[in-house]
């Protein structure tokens, strides 16, 4: 299934790929050269390094296995933003085959509060919350190459879809009312 | 000028078009539909809602008449992401004829340092960032329809190009402990 | 030590006027956000009215807007409401309180209370 | 008619443990660990006992401790002593109208 990150919109290609027009994991070659490379897209760029140092993949769910860090400042001077933010977050790589970029970065909060500057510890009084970006994705599923229903194995039609990808986090006021 | 969010990566098209083929402000139609529609993209999206509410346009530097807002309780109850924040941002309208889409509603922090939770009042001890993420575009340039090294009047050339687009803020420790 | 002190309660007539005060001290009072809570004898505490640490914002609650007004001094440490159009209704101890975070219910610093009675 | 429901009394001997409810809605109590409790002593003014959820000011005995289930927090006090004996309130964000709401109060009655 693909991420539930926000209601996808999308636009279907019309054409019926065959698995030999296919290159393991690729998108038609006709629809990745008329658009940018989507390997510079962020959330793209950064699943090179995320697997070079062992990130986690997939679905497990948001602060799985996480805790909210604890601040100090003299760790964080030459530290990444999403280090240094006081609603840290961490990137995830989610996987998809249906989908080109099959692999994305994405970011989730390590903290549902945020943290203390003096403490370096959480504080409940405020809230992390993500920060969510749109990206433009292609997304297949299995079609007819012969006009019947039923779909031919190994044969794929596409459509462009913009999915909704939290790209970071940032610490809110809670927002509670009656 | 294209904006100085990043710097951008692109992909040439090889097709010179003339002005006929293009409607006022658009990119050829096959690039259109071969992709998601472009306003699904949340910097897209934001635009209408902005021009509606009379939003501050184009390239009035950061922080130009604004600051730091104070959100009053009774207030955070029921704002956005963007006022609700602890780093505060407002979207900015940026217009640009050469790509499309020629408007992208783009976030600029409204304070240096972050709201101080306990007070409501600017704390210099954090500091408020942007959280940049990439955004795929059409550029599009002059080009020659007849062969020479000269221009044709009213002919584009197109190539897709990402670039670094500030979707929000986030509040971070200094990377100085001066 | 920390402390808020109010003064000004007594007893008023119905629609008469009174003015209370909170005195602040041990503490950097330009720094916070303070309210007004008061307790009806007998019953709970019930809150009426915050002002900024700088004094430009103010907030009531619907059983005292329009009647009251709280302001403050910061460079003489002080806090005031004003109560016009005094009704049964107000009769209360009422408390000044510092608010550890400026948006939240925390309130780490109380005063003593000073009664208030409206009676004919 | 508060909009955060404590029961109107509980009561405790010495050494035991009471845990007093705060009932809110999912909005309010539900949504964030925002509650704060208050004791108060006959003739006195209330005192911060606990705030966001179950955090204690330095000063506060660590008997007393805060706790959230769902829509619903609560206050513990284990080892109950005599200077127990007091009413109880806990206090979250309200709407617009009233922004700040408190709970009813519950009375705790140290026996014996």
């Known amino acids: 299934d693909p991420p539930s990150w926000g209601k996808p919109r999308s636009h279907r290609t019309l054409r019926c790929y065959s698995a030999e027009e296919l290159s393991h994991g690729q998108a038609p070659p006709h629809l990745l050269t008329r658009s940018a490379r989507w390997e510079q897209a962020l959330p793209v760029a950064l699943v090179a390094s995320l697997e070079a140092t062992g990130h986690r993949r997939q679905h497990e769910g948001p602060l799985a296995g996480t805790q909210c860090p604890v601040l100090r400042p003299e760790e964080v001077l030459e530290a990444d933003t999403h280090e240094r933010s006081i609603s840290p977050w961490r990137y995830r790589i989610d996987t998809d085959e249906n989908r080109y970029p099959q692999k994305l970065a994405v970011a989730e909060c390590l903290c549902r509060g945020c943290i203390n500057a003096k403490t370096g510890r959480e504080t409940a009084a405020l809230n992390s919350v993500q920060l969510l970006q749109s990206l433009l994705v292609l997304r297949r599923q299995p079609c007819s190459r012969d006009g019947t229903a039923d779909p031919t194995p190994g044969s794929f039609a596409f459509h462009t879809e913009f999915i909704r990808v939290p790209v970071g986090c940032t610490c809110v006021l809670p927002r509670s009312t009656q | 000028d294209p904006p100085s969010w990043g710097k951008p990566r692109s992909h040439r098209t090889l097709r010179c078009y003339s002005a006929e083929e293009l409607s006022h402000g658009q990119a050829p139609p096959h690039l259109l539909t071969r992709s998601a529609r472009w306003e699904q993209a949340l910097p897209v999206a934001l635009v209408a809602s902005l021009e509606a509410t009379g939003h501050r346009r184009q390239h009035e530097g950061p922080l130009a008449g604004t600051q730091c807002p104070v959100l009053r309780p009774e207030e955070v109850l029921e704002a956005d992401t963007h006022e609700r924040s602890i780093s505060p941002w407002r979207y900015r309208i940026d217009t640009d004829e050469n790509r499309y889409p020629q408007k992208l509603a783009v976030a600029e922090c409204l304070c240096r340092g972050c709201i101080n939770a306990k007070t409501g009042r600017e704390t210099a001890a954090l500091n408020s960032v942007q959280l940049l993420q990439s955004l795929l575009v059409l550029r599009r340039q002059p080009c020659s329809r007849d062969g020479t090294a000269d221009p044709t009047p009213g002919s584009f050339a197109f190539h897709t190009e990402f670039i670094r687009v500030p979707v929000g803020c986030t509040c971070v420790l200094p990377r100085s402990t001066q | 030590q920390v402390q808020l002190v109010e003064s000004g309660g007594g007893l008023v007539k119905p629609g008469g006027s009174l003015r209370l005060s909170c005195a602040a001290s041990?503490?950097?009072?330009?720094?916070?956000?303070i309210s007004w809570i008061r307790q009806a004898p007998g019953k709970g505490l019930e809150w009426v009215s915050y002002i900024s640490s700088s004094g430009s914002t103010t907030y009531y609650a619907e059983s005292v807007k329009g009647r009251f007004t709280i302001s403050r001094d910061n460079a003489k440490n002080s806090l005031y409401l004003q109560m016009n159009s005094l009704r049964a209704e107000d009769t209360a101890v009422y408390y000044c309180?510092?608010?550890?975070?400026?948006?939240?219910?925390?309130?780490?610093?109380w005063g003593q209370g000073t009664l208030v009675t409206v009676s004919s | 008619q508060s909009a955060l429901t404590q029961p109107a009394s509980v009561s405790g001997s010495p050494g035991q443990s009471i845990t007093i409810s705060c009932t809110g809605t999912s909005s309010d109590v539900g949504s964030y660990n925002l509650v704060s409790w208050y004791q108060q002593h006959p003739g006195k003014a209330p005192k911060l006992m606990i705030y966001e959820g179950s955090k204690r000011p330095s000063g506060v005995s660590n008997r007393f401790s805060g706790s959230k289930s769902g829509n619903t927090a609560s206050l513990t006090i284990s080892g109950l002593q005599a200077e127990d004996e007091a009413d109880y309130y806990c206090a979250s964000r309200g709407s617009r109208r009233v922004l700040y709401v408190f709970g009813g109060g519950t009375k705790l009655t140290v026996l014996g």
């Open positions: 041990g503490f950097t009072f330009s720094d916070h956000y």
């Open positions: 309180a510092r608010q550890s975070y400026y948006f939240l219910p925390y309130f780490d610093v």
